[in-house]
């Protein structure tokens, strides 16, 4: 807390300008009117205040707006935003995407701070859903943003927003998140032709069910091994050797290098060795010839 002291004669601030950087903390407290500061917030960012001085300016705004700052002030906080606590930000009502962008710009190039996370949360909740423009903005500043959301939060993403997602935005997503995003992507890209569709859907395929993989295998997509290795194991297991061969196209040779890793390892164990041999890759571990395969899950369903 800065002590209340009278402003020295002739030092009362008539406007927010560069002369204030030479004011001591107590002088800022005594000589800068909070209402003046609020109306000239757009100037603060251009003035080289120290963070110690910004603390004083924040204190003045807190006194003026105990219930939370209005958006007209928030939009121009600039570096003062870094002085806000998550508790401060929870009092705000941020509705403008321009305000969000302005504040994210301040933190650009740095990890997502608790302040930024709270700001985004407030903004998205205020909008009711993660629309395309918001998602566009957030992933531009934080490519991993989408994968930081829970499956429940992702469920509020409308399919139209999926167009804003780039492959790198999904790098850190786990299968549970892709399970939610894949159906939205499928819906978003449904009117595209085969090859264009595959390019767009590829990074979401970690959430694809078996039937969709079977359908893709009929379209000469030539899936690369990196994508194949990210598929759900339970979706890959029912695929036949012929289907996997068609799905991977020329990349099928890469299975050999991955035969000890999931989902390739588990898939091999489910295939007849005879069928695996047709690939000519030397894949071992399939079901020996002459053995009968009982699908116990089907048997249970019938009984």
């Amino acid at each position: 807390e800065v002590e209340k002291t009278a402003c020295p004669s002739g030092k009362k601030a008539r406007e927010i300008d560069e002369s204030l950087i030479f004011y001591k903390k107590w002088e800022l407290e005594a000589c800068v009117d909070a209402a003046l500061l609020a109306t000239q917030m757009d100037r603060v960012n251009a003035i080289p205040f120290t963070y110690e001085q910004l603390d004083v300016l924040k204190h003045k705004l807190d006194e003026l707006y105990p219930q939370g700052y209005p958006e007209s002030v928030i939009q121009h906080l600039g570096y003062l935003f870094l002085k806000m606590s998550p508790e401060d930000i929870r009092k705000w009502n941020v509705t403008s995407l321009e305000t969000l962008k302005a504040l994210l710009e301040v933190n650009k190039g740095h990890e997502m701070s608790p302040q930024v996370a709270t700001l985004i949360d407030r903004f998205v909740k205020g909008r009711g859903q993660l629309d395309k423009d918001t998602l566009d903005t957030l992933t531009a500043f934080y490519p991993g943003y989408l994968c930081s959301l829970s499956p429940e939060e992702l469920s509020s993403v409308p399919p139209s927003s999926i167009w804003a997602v780039r492959p790198q935005d999904l790098d850190t997503c786990d299968p549970r998140q892709l399970d939610v995003l894949y159906p939205k992507a499928r819906l978003a890209f449904q009117n595209m032709n085969g090859s264009e569709y595959f390019v767009k859907i590829q990074s979401f395929l970690g959430g694809a069910p078996t039937e969709d993989l079977k359908a893709l295998s009929q379209q000469n997509v030539s899936m690369d091994l990196a994508t194949f290795m990210k598929l759900r194991t339970d979706a890959v297991l029912p695929l036949t050797v012929a289907e996997v061969q068609k799905l991977l196209g020329p990349h099928v040779e890469g299975l050999k290098a991955e035969e000890r890793h999931r989902p390739v390892r588990d898939w091999i164990l489910r295939q007849r060795q005879d069928d695996l041999d047709t690939l000519g890759l030397g894949l071992q571990g399939g079901i020996p010839n002459g053995y009968l395969v009982l699908d116990l899950s089907m048997q249970e369903a019938l009984s």
């Epitope: 080289p48 963070y51 110690e52 570096y79 870094l82 933190n107 740095h110």
Partner: nanobody, 115 residues
Framework: EVQLVESGGGLIQPGGSLRLSCAAS????????MGWHRQAPGKGLELVST???????YYANFVKGRFTISRDNSKNTLYLQMNSLRAEDTAVYYC?????????WGQGTLVTVSS
């Protein structure tokens, strides 16, 4: 983190000149602006001069025309050229870097102006 180390202080006669240096290291890419502050014996800390990343400079009235602040980005060093020194310039001079999201300070260098 940003580390700052000042040098160049010493005993100088009134009317003389000194050049202070401040070598910055660490996360220097996060620095927004840097400055020189001073604290005279028994007095509070006061800002002498500031320079922004784009080279805009600001001076306190009591040093205008006598002191010059500059930066050498290739050496990550901040300078304060002090000319026409007076007895009242005697103080510990501190280098400060305002970087994301705090202020970093050097340990200070003593300048004594005395005949």
């Amino acid at each position: 983190e940003v580390q700052l180390v000042e040098s160049g202080g010493g005993l100088i006669q009134p009317g003389g000149s000194l050049r202070l240096s401040c070598a910055a290291s660490g996360n220097i890419g996060s620095i927004r602006h840097m400055g020189w502050h001073r604290q005279a014996p028994g007095k509070g800390l006061e800002l002498v001069s500031t320079i922004t990343t784009v080279g805009t400079t600001y001076y306190a009235n009591f040093v205008k025309g006598r002191f010059t602040i500059s930066r050498d980005n290739s050496k990550n060093t901040l300078y304060l050229q002090m000319n026409s020194l007076r007895a009242e310039d005697t103080a510990v001079y501190y280098c400060r870097a305002t970087a994301h999201p705090t202020d970093y300070w050097g340990q200070g260098t003593l300048v004594t102006v005395s005949s």
